[in-house]
């Protein structure tokens, strides 16, 4: 008799722990990826961002890797995925090559397994950055909500890397899990 | 037999709700404060917002507080911040002295334990507002997902509230916990 | 005896699997709807924008619904919600009725119980697409997090909805839910 | 030495015309607001005219608002005053002020010329 | 517009004396308030504005108070340098109008 009870709680206990390992003892994984100002690009034209920080001031990454300059997806889920992007021009950094530019960004996913590359969110505006100024900024913000599998790589794109704000506060991008997948 | 197996019981109850207290009766913070538009400070460099609705309109707060100005985090956690912040003239409103603005927001956290202030997110648009048209409006849009400890202050500052929209459709911030530290 | 711990144990699993279902197996609602590009109204005042899609390419959709233009809520909660709003003209598209263009979007809620609408989130901004450039474009993203009624739908509105541009990594709102409401 | 030098003053007879210029030196013109400020013999001062740093927005008090036109030459470092049908009572002294950054919507002055004579008189 | 009552418009005071001039505005002004200083012949100086922020290289001696409608403008200890008329000044809204001014003499 007291071995069946024993038994039966621990179905309970098995249970419990799973309901417990799944909502709150094993971690939603995130990330907040902060720009790396001394390995930006040059170009006009779309790049893409590989030099993050994930581990010094705000940058940070739990239950998610960061691998050849993409974030790469370990746990299947639906994940908020964001980004902020600023770009900025003072005088003294020298002449612009033209007043017109075209200011994006770009937040992409990759299957590995079906070699694809998708633009999940994209932002960004057209700027007049005349010379009557003698200083110029501009930012984005993207964000929405996407199922991620297991594997998934999500990067950056922008134009004009060259007049990206190279402070932690200005240009970064991030995830966060939500919810599994039914 | 039968007291051991109430508190047999009585651990698995134990257990079950303290993860149900956690997980979902101890509700997780959140906060969403309004522009109090009755009191804009005036300025044109960065200054702090000292003044926000948490309990009329769509304001609203729980297991957070708003003192002196600042959101106030009473729960350790990982948690999404995001700020609207949405500027405008219109010919009526007063003699504008330029029309060339720097519209900016910058949310900052600040720690008592360690009297620093840090800015976690910033955005805006420098801007060439001209008096060829009668109405000029700009907004910005910020998010991120921040470590915070309790008694950490988050705050927000920006650069011409003379300009901010009092609508508390316009101009918000807010945050609200999305997981745990581990 | 046997029947007294079976009993037990099945408040004990009952218990359990109410709190299950309603941290786990009872999905959190969410939605994500792209502009739906064959549908685009035209106008250049304020016009609610109906068609969306929640069941292709990145839109997607669970306990919540789509109907009649709007994304109606199913169970009582916080929301985070999101809108990314991008605008964009090239010459060849024909010439602009005026180079001075207000691109707004406003993220309304409708109480169909107390037929009301009320704006939650407001942003754009004015522009000037003069005729120098051949191509112009202007994002905006809000979000904002939100109590929302089971039968309360949110809806989007834009200004100059013929610029919209219709991918579906440019124009698209969402919807998660975060929390309960206590 | 940020200076501000006005010109152009001068005696008018009543309903006649006058263009009052301000050159400015020492400091990047083209990023402050300025105005014109006039003092009539032996009273205080009046704000007459203002005009936004880039030129697009111009401002004036109703008592002379449809005579005097402000302007600006960025490219020059010049702020100019046209005053058309002179009245006896916009005799005075007419100051080149600059406007002090502040708030966008308030107009305080920190840098002031030395003033140039306008008599309207028969 | 609105209407700047300065007072008293003339005062006679002895080197050291602390001198007070008052502004009233005829509507809530917040604290948009500057004080400037006109010696004979001579141009205006800024000295106070947004009613207490003293202007780059005024001494301490000169400071301003007050918000609303009610400001005041101090000079701790009267200097000979200090002779001129002192007016105020509304910026919160066009158009800006000035006080009718304050004498000050050494007695």
């Known amino acids: 008799g007291s071995q069946h009870i024993r038994a039966e709680k621990a179905m309970v206990d098995g249970s419990w722990l799973d309901l417990a390992k799944r909502s709150k003892l094993e971690a939603q994984p995130f990330a907040h990826l902060t720009i790396n100002a001394t390995d930006i690009p040059s170009g006009s034209h779309k790049v893409s961002l590989s030099s993050w920080y994930h581990d010094r001031g705000w940058g940070k990454i739990s239950n998610m890797t960061f691998s050849n300059g993409k974030l790469i997806v370990n746990q299947d889920g639906f994940y908020y995925l964001y980004a902020n992007i600023c770009f900025r021009h003072h005088e003294t950094s020298g002449d612009l090559a033209t007043e017109y530019l075209q200011l994006m960004v770009y937040v992409t996913k990759t299957s590995i397994k079906i070699p694809s590359s998708h633009t999940l969110m994209k932002g960004g505006s057209t700027k007049y950055w005349s010379g009557n100024s003698e200083f110029h900024f501009y930012s984005i913000n993207v964000g929405g909500f996407f199922k991620l599998r297991s594997g998934e790589e999500i990067s950056i794109e922008v134009s004009n890397p060259s007049l990206l704000d190279p402070d932690q506060d200005a240009t970064y991008f991030g995830a966060f899990k939500v919810r599994d997948i039914d | 037999g039968s007291q051991h197996i109430r508190a047999e019981k009585a651990m698995v109850d134990g257990s079950w709700l303290d993860l149900a207290k956690r997980s979902k009766l101890e509700a997780q913070p959140f906060a969403h404060l309004t522009i109090n538009a009755t009191d804009i400070p005036s300025g044109s460099h960065k200054v702090s917002l000292s003044s926000w609705y948490h309990d009329r309109g769509w304001g609203k707060i729980s297991n957070m507080t708003f003192s002196n100005g600042k959101l106030i985090v009473n729960q350790d956690g990982f948690y999404y911040l995001y700020a609207n912040i949405c500027f405008r003239h219109h010919e009526t409103s007063g003699d504008l002295a330029t029309e060339y603005l720097q519209l900016m927001v910058y949310v900052t956290k600040t720690s008592i334990k360690i009297p620093s202030s840090h800015t976690l997110m910033k955005g805006g648009s420098t801007k060439y507002w001209s008096g060829n048209s009668e109405f000029h409006f700009y907004s910005i849009n910020v998010g991120g997902f921040f470590k915070l400890r309790s008694g950490e202050e988050i705050s927000i500052e920006v650069s011409n509230p003379s300009l901010l929209d009092p609508d508390q459709d316009a101009t918000y911030f807010g945050a609200f916990k999305v997981r745990d530290i581990d | 005896g046997s029947q007294h711990i079976r009993a037990e144990k099945a408040m004990v699993d009952g218990s359990w699997l109410d709190l299950a279902k309603r941290s786990k197996l009872e999905a959190q609602p969410f939605a994500h709807l792209t502009i739906n590009a064959t549908d685009i109204p035209s106008g250049s005042h304020k016009v609610s924008l109906s068609s969306w899609y929640h069941d292709r390419g990145w839109g997607k959709i669970s306990n919540m619904t789509f109907s009649n233009g709007k994304l109606i809520v199913n169970q009582d909660g916080f929301y985070y919600l999101y809108a990314n709003i991008c605008f964009r003209h090239h010459e060849t598209s024909g010439d602009l009725a005026t180079e001075y263009l207000q691109l707004m979007v406003y993220v309304t809620k409708t109480s169909i119980k107390i037929p009301s609408s009320h704006t939650l989130m407001k942003g754009g901004s004015t522009k000037y697409w003069s005729g120098n450039s051949e191509f112009h474009f202007y994002s905006i993203n809000v979000g904002g997090f939100f109590k929302l009624r089971s039968g309360e739908e949110i809806s989007i509105e834009v200004s100059n909805p013929s610029l919209l541009d219709p991918d579906q990594d440019a124009t698209y709102f969402g919807a998660f839910k975060v929390r309960d409401i206590d | 030495e940020v200076q501000l030098v006005e010109s152009g003053g001068g005696l008018v007879k009543p309903g006649g015309s006058l263009r009052l210029s301000c050159a400015a030196s020492?400091?990047?013109?083209?990023?402050?607001?300025m105005s014109w400020v006039r003092q009539a013999p032996g009273k205080g001062l009046e704000w007459v005219a203002g005009?936004?740093?880039?030129?697009?927005?111009?401002y004036y008090p109703d008592t002379v608002k449809g005579r005097f036109t402000i302007s600006r030459d960025n490219a020059r470092n010049s702020l100019y005053l046209q005053m058309n049908s002179l009245r006896a009572e916009d005799t005075a002294v007419y100051y080149c002020?600059?406007?002090?950054?502040?708030?966008?919507?308030?107009?305080?002055?920190?840098?002031w010329g030395t003033g140039t004579t306008v008599t309207v008189s028969s | 517009d609105i209407q700047m009552t300065q007072s008293p418009s003339s005062l006679s005071a002895s080197v050291g004396d602390r001198v007070t001039i008052t502004c009233k505005a005829s509507?809530?002004?917040?604290?948009?308030i500057a004080w400037y200083q006109q010696k004979p012949g001579k141009a205006p100086k800024l000295l106070i504005y947004?009613?207490?922020y003293r202007y780059t290289g005024v001494p301490s001696r000169f400071s301003g108070s007050g918000s609303g409608t009610d400001f005041t403008f101090t000079i701790s200890s009267l200097q000979p340098e200090d002779i001129a008329t002192y007016y105020c000044?509304?910026?919160?809204?066009?158009?800006?109008?000035f006080g009718g001014g304050t004498k000050v003499e050494i007695k």
């Open positions: 947004s009613a207490s």
């Open positions: 509507q809530d002004v917040r604290t948009s």
């Open positions: 020492g400091f990047t013109f083209r990023n402050y607001a």
């Open positions: 000044q509304q910026h919160y809204s066009s158009p800006w109008t």
């Open positions: 005009i936004s740093s880039g030129g697009t927005y111009t």
């Open positions: 002020a600059r406007r002090d950054y502040g708030d966008v919507y308030e107009w305080y002055f920190d840098v």
